[in-house]
């Protein structure tokens, strides 16, 4: 029972985590304009992995995609790659783990096969989570580096009356979503790996011991009670109870159309 709970919880946690990784990858707010020097700005800039956006005080938002591939920084390409690898591995992991769930019966699948699949999906979730965390961390590091560089150069080129203030960028919401989602996927993967140990069949097979009573020959096999009640780890037993797969509706909230600076 504990194994099923661990496996189920691991699956749900990973599912939430991967949904979060997908959301973070698609989000535009990976980096947002630092408002420290100008908290009441009339033009607010923010950037994602795929496009950069500008939100005016008028409520008008304009987004422009990065239509070049070669002209983009290598670090940004690396972050994109890490996030996509994370999503792909996570999606495959989810697919594998659905079939590995103890509460779902698929033909006459052995518990050993389910254990292997659980372990595989668990490893996939762990790698997926690590990819997401790595991707977000690389981007965050890039932001920190650029932030201090632009701070050092902030008022350079100030000639006479004219001031040129560089736009500085700080951590956007997507980074925090990515870190949390990556962490959840990682935790879910670990839980799946733990569940795998409980699913694996015990190697020790007890041999039947015969007891000869007067005039009767009764064979007693240990584990017989377990087998009849559906408990224990007898691999020959088919699980009669099917808990069914529960699906949850996911609700994603997006910023309002009129999100003013």
């Amino acid at each position: 029972m504990a194994v099923t709970a661990c496996q189920g919880l691991g699956f749900v946690v990973s599912l939430i985590g991967i949904a979060g990784i997908i959301a973070a990858t698609c989000m535009d707010q990976w980096s947002t304009q630092d408002l420290y020097n100008n908290p009441v700005t009339a033009v607010f800039n923010y950037q994602g992995l795929w496009r950069s956006c500008v939100r005016e005080s008028s409520g008008f938002t304009e987004c422009r995609g990065y239509f070049t591939l070669l002209g983009l920084p290598a670090m940004l390409q690396a972050v994109r790659a890490l996030m996509i690898v994370g999503i792909v591995l996570g999606a495959i992991g989810l697919l594998v783990s659905i079939f590995a769930l103890k509460c779902i019966r698929i033909g006459s699948m052995e518990d050993s096969a389910k254990a292997n699949m659980t372990l595989t999906s668990g490893i996939m979730f762990i790698v997926s989570g690590l990819c997401a965390i790595a991707g977000v961390s690389v981007f965050a590091n890039m932001l920190v580096t650029n932030f201090w560089m632009s701070t050092a150069n902030m008022y350079t080129g100030m000639g006479g009356m004219v001031q040129t203030v560089q736009t500085r960028y700080t951590f956007g919401a997507a980074l925090f979503v990515g870190w949390v989602a990556g962490g959840l996927t990682l935790i879910g993967g670990v839980m799946m790996c733990i569940a795998c140990r409980g699913l694996a069949p015990e190697e020790t097979n007890y041999k039947a011991v015969s007891y000869h009573a007067s005039g009767h020959s009764v064979a007693y096999k240990p584990g017989g009670f377990k087998a009849s009640t559906g408990f224990g780890s007898n691999t020959k037993n088919k699980k009669i109870y099917d808990g069914g797969a529960r699906t949850e509706d996911e609700v994603q909230s997006y910023p309002s159309k009129h999100d003013y600076v």
């Epitope: 956006c53 005080s57 309002s256």
Partner: antibody
Framework: QVQLVQSGSELKKPGASVKVSCKAS????????MNWVRQAPGQGLEWMGW????????TYAEDFKGRFVFSLDTSVSTAYLQICSLKAEDTAVYYC???????????WGQGTLVTVSS | DIVMTQSPDSLAVSLGERATINCKSS????????????LTWYQQKPGQPPKLLIY???TRESGVPDRFSGSGSGTDFTLTISSLQAEDVAVYYC?????????FGQGTKLEIK
């Protein structure tokens, strides 16, 4: 079409208060910011501030903090400018203007002349 | 605050001739995020409210005749009327839309020579 219709001219004594209204039609008031601009006789335009449509929170230019109050009544699609403790130098035409793409003032009221004289 | 300085204060041009008004800002109005200059031009005729002519430094508002054009980037901007018409007699203002408080130039009075 978008229209901003302001209340009529006002003649006030120093120390009194005045409330200028600006009725919006042809669009939803809560979708666009409302700006207030002052133009003293024979002078240029002075941006007084604006009121955010989603929160109704006003932002005032430095010279207009204190005696000037912006407000919105969405039920009647009207923006208001209230000036307290009127001074002679408040004599001007006050315009309301909608904030639009490019942070521009694309539609203006016809203006309300407020005259402060003893 | 961003200071907007227009030149000249007044300008007299013959009908059909080119009129040029300059506007200089104390800070860069070019937004790096979308490469747009947040500078707007308005026309104000006597006894009327201002009318939007050009935004984003060079984008003409719908309904504005194509003899009006805007140019410039960063801190230096120009409004050009290619062929002056009698109805173009007005005061022209530039406005910063990049940061609060929004500020206007002192205005340029355009007259017919």
């Amino acid at each position: 079409q978008v229209q901003l219709v302001q209340s009529g001219s006002e003649l006030k004594k120093p120390g009194a208060s005045v409330k200028v209204s600006c009725k919006a039609s042809g669009y939803t008031l809560t979708n666009y910011g409302m700006n207030w601009v002052r133009q003293a006789p024979g002078q240029g335009l002075e941006w007084m501030g604006w009121i955010r449509p989603n929160t109704g929170e006003p932002t005032y230019a430095e010279d207009f903090k204190g005696r000037f109050v912006f407000s919105l009544d969405t039920s009647v699609s009207t923006a208001y400018l209230q000036i307290c403790s009127l001074k002679a130098e408040d004599t001007a035409v006050y315009y309301c203007a909608r904030l639009y793409r490019g942070n521009t003032l694309d539609n203006w009221g016809q203006g309300t002349l407020v005259t402060v004289s003893s | 605050d961003i200071v907007m300085t227009q030149s000249p204060d007044s300008l007299a041009v013959s009908l059909g001739e080119r009129a040029t008004i300059n506007c200089k800002s104390s800070q860069n109005l070019l937004n790096s995020g979308n490469q747009r200059n947040y500078l707007t031009w308005y026309q104000q005729k006597p006894g009327q409210p201002p009318k939007l002519l050009i935004y984003w430094a060079s984008t003409r508002e719908s309904g504005v005749p194509d003899r009006f054009s805007g140019s410039g980037s960063g801190t230096d901007f120009t409004l050009t009327i290619s062929s002056l018409q009698a109805e173009d007699v007005a005061v022209y203002y530039c406005q910063n839309g990049y940061s609060f408080p929004f500020t206007f130039g002192q205005g340029t009075k355009l007259e017919i020579k």
